[in-house]
C-alpha cells in the first residue's frame, strides 16, 4: 500500500479511510500543483485507472464515487494530466479499508491445563471483521472486586500467580476495532472447576493367547486429582462407529482396561478424562493403533454380547464420525447401555 | 516495564473543553497499543478511545464527534482532546498501555468533573 508518499495536493474519504464494508464512498482528490492547470484529474485503484462515476467539481478538485464499497482493503492515488507533460503527474494516494464491527465473542470457555500455570480462555470471534480487531478480556474478582484486563487477538492465557487473591471470578471479552465494540456474555469461574488433568496417554496394548483373547490396553496419566472421570474409544481402522466405555480411574498406577475385540483387525484407541463431576473434558488423547491377533480356535464372535470385564467400566454407546476425512467429529446417534447407569450426556462434544 | 502519567484534568462547565495527556517512560512502549478508560464512580473502567495498528481508532458511541485520540511518537505521549463536556463525562480518565497476552497496565489517573 502506500504509506509514505510526497504528495503535490490532498486525498482524503468520506466516510473516512477506514469504513464499514458495502457503504458508499466518496473519495476526492485535490491537486496543488505548481506550474499546471490539469486538463484531467485521474483516479486508480490497486494501480488500474477508473473510468466511471467521477465527478470533476471544480478547477483543482475531483470526486470518484463508488456504489456499495466491498473490498477489505484498496490503494488508491490520483494524478493530473499536465499540458506539455508526457506522463501524467502524482497528486497524493490513500490507502483505504471497509471492514465490519465486530460480533459478540460467545461461547466464552476458560480452562486450567494441570501444571500449566495458566488460566486459558478462548471465544467464538464470529464473522471475519477484516480490519484490525482486539479482544480485551476482563477479569473480575468476586471476592475482592479488584478488576483486571488483557489484551488479546484471538485467545488469552492469564498467569494463575496473577489469580492469587480469589478463587471466583467473573470473566467477559469486550470485541473492538474502529467500526464498534461489542461484549460477550460474562463467565462465572471458579478456579477449582475448571482444572483439566494432566494429559492422558495410552502406552501399549496387548492381545492375550487365551481361548477367548482379550486385548489389555495400558494408559495413564501424570495427574495429581484423585478421582477422575474418563472416556475411552475405540473402532476398527475400517468402521465409522465408536464404540465408548467409561471409566473412573485413580493413576496412581497404571491403568488397564480389558477389551474383546474382533480377531485380526486394526483398532484404533483414544482416552480423554476430566476432573469427576467437572464438565471441561482434555482433548482425545492421539490415536493409538493395535493389530488384534489372529484367531486360533474356531468361534462365534458377537461384538455386542462380549463379556465386558469387572473393571469400573459404567457404560458403552456407539458414536458414529460424520465423516471418514474427520475422525475427530463425532456425533451421538445411539447409546447401547451394557451395565450401569446410562450415559452422562456429555458425548455431544466428543472430538 | 512502561509507566505512565496523566494529566490535564480538572474541572469545567459543560459545553467546555479539556486536553488530556499521557506520557510513557520505559523500553516496551512502542509495543504498546493505547487507550484511554474512564471509570466514574462504582462503575467499570471502560474504554473510551484506543488506536490500532492499522491507524484507525475506536471512539465509545458516547463520545463520538467529541473526543480525539492523537499521539506525538517522538514524544511517547498520546491526547485526549475533550471538547463539548456533559456532566456524565465527569469520572476518573486513565490512560493504559495494552499488549497482547499480557496485563494491561495503568496510569494513576486524572479527575475530570463537569458540571451543568
Known amino acids: 500500500g502506500i504509506t509514505s508518499i510526497n504528495c503535490s495536493g490532498d486525498m482524503w474519504v468520506e466516510p473516512g479511510e477506514i469504513f464499514q464494508m458495502g457503504m458508499n464512498v466518496s473519495i476526492y482528490c485535490q491537486e496543488a500543483l505548481k506550474h499546471c492547470r490539469p486538463r484531467n484529474l485521474y483516479f486508480y485503484k490497486n494501480g488500474f485507472k477508473e473510468e466511471f462515476d467521477i465527478t470533476r467539481i471544480n478547477r483543482t478538485t475531483a470526486r470518484i464515487w463508488y456504489k456499495g464499497f466491498s473490498e477489505p482493503h484498496a490503494y488508491m492515488h490520483c494524478t493530473a494530466e499536465c499540458p506539455g507533460h508526457f506522463q501524467e503527474t502524482l497528486i497524493c494516494g490513500k490507502d483505504i479499508s471497509s471492514g465490519h464491527p465486530p460480533d459478540a465473542p460467545s461461547n466464552l470457555t476458560c480452562v486450567i491445563y494441570e501444571y500449566s500455570g495458566n488460566m486459558t480462555c478462548t471465544w467464538n470471534t464470529g464473522k471475519p471483521t477484516y480490519i484490525d480487531t482486539k479482544y480485551i478480556v476482563h477479569v473480575k474478582s468476586l471476592e475482592t472486586e479488584e478488576e483486571q484486563q488483557y489484551l488479546a487477538s484471538s485467545y488469552v492465557k492469564i498467569s494463575t500467580d496473577s489469580l492469587q487473591g480469589s478463587r471466583k471470578y467473573l470473566v467477559w471479552v469486550q470485541a473492538v476495532n474502529s467500526l464498534g465494540m461489542e461484549n460477550s456474555q460474562q463467565l462465572h469461574v471458579h478456579l477449582d472447576d475448571i482444572v483439566i488433568p494432566s494429559a492422558s496417554i495410552i502406552s501399549r496394548a496387548e492381545t492375550t493367547n487365551d481361548t477367548v483373547p482379550k486385548t489389555i490396553v495400558y494408559w495413564k496419566s501424570k495427574t495429581m486429582i484423585e478421582k477422575v472421570f474418563c472416556e475411552m474409544r475405540y473402532k476398527t481402522t475400517t468402521n465409522q462407529t465408536w464404540s465408548v466405555k467409561e471409566f473412573d480411574a485413580n493413576f496412581t498406577y497404571v491403568q488397564q482396561s480389558e477389551f474383546y475385540l474382533e480377531p485380526d483387525s486394526k483398532y484404533v484407541f483414544q482416552v480423554r478424562c476430566q476432573e469427576t463431576g467437572k464438565r471441561n473434558w482434555q482433548p482425545w488423547s492421539s490415536p493409538f493403533v493395535h493389530q488384534t491377533s489372529q484367531e486360533t480356535g474356531k468361534r462365534n464372535w458377537q461384538p455386542w454380547s462380549s463379556p465386558f470385564v469387572h473393571q469400573t467400566s459404567q457404560t458403552v454407546s456407539q458414536v458414529t464420525a460424520k465423516s471418514s476425512h474427520e475422525p475427530q467429529k463425532m456425533e451421538m446417534l445411539s447409546a447401547t447401555i451394557f451395565r450401569g447407569h446410562p450415559a452422562s450426556g456429555n458425548h455431544q462434544d466428543i472430538g | 516495564q512502561v509507566q505512565l502519567q496523566e494529566s490535564g484534568g480538572g474541572s469545567v462547565q459543560a459545553g467546555g473543553s479539556l486536553r488530556l495527556s499521557c506520557a510513557a517512560s520505559g523500553d516496551t512502549y512502542s509495543s504498546c497499543t493505547m487507550g484511554w478508560y474512564r471509570q466514574a464512580p462504582g462503575k467499570e473502567r471502560d474504554l473510551v478511545s484506543m488506536?490500532?495498528?492499522?491507524?484507525?481508532?475506536f471512539y465509545a458511541d458516547s463520545v463520538k464527534g467529541r473526543f480525539t485520540f492523537s499521539q506525538e511518537n517522538a514524544k511517547n505521549t498520546v491526547y485526549l482532546q475533550m471538547n463539548s463536556l456533559k456532566p456524565e463525562d465527569t469520572a476518573m480518565y486513565y490512560c493504559g498501555c495494552a499488549t497482547l497476552g499480557s496485563r494491561t497496565i495503568w496510569g494513576q489517573g486524572t479527575q475530570v468533573t463537569v458540571s451543568s
Open positions: 488506536v490500532f495498528s492499522d491507524g484507525s481508532t
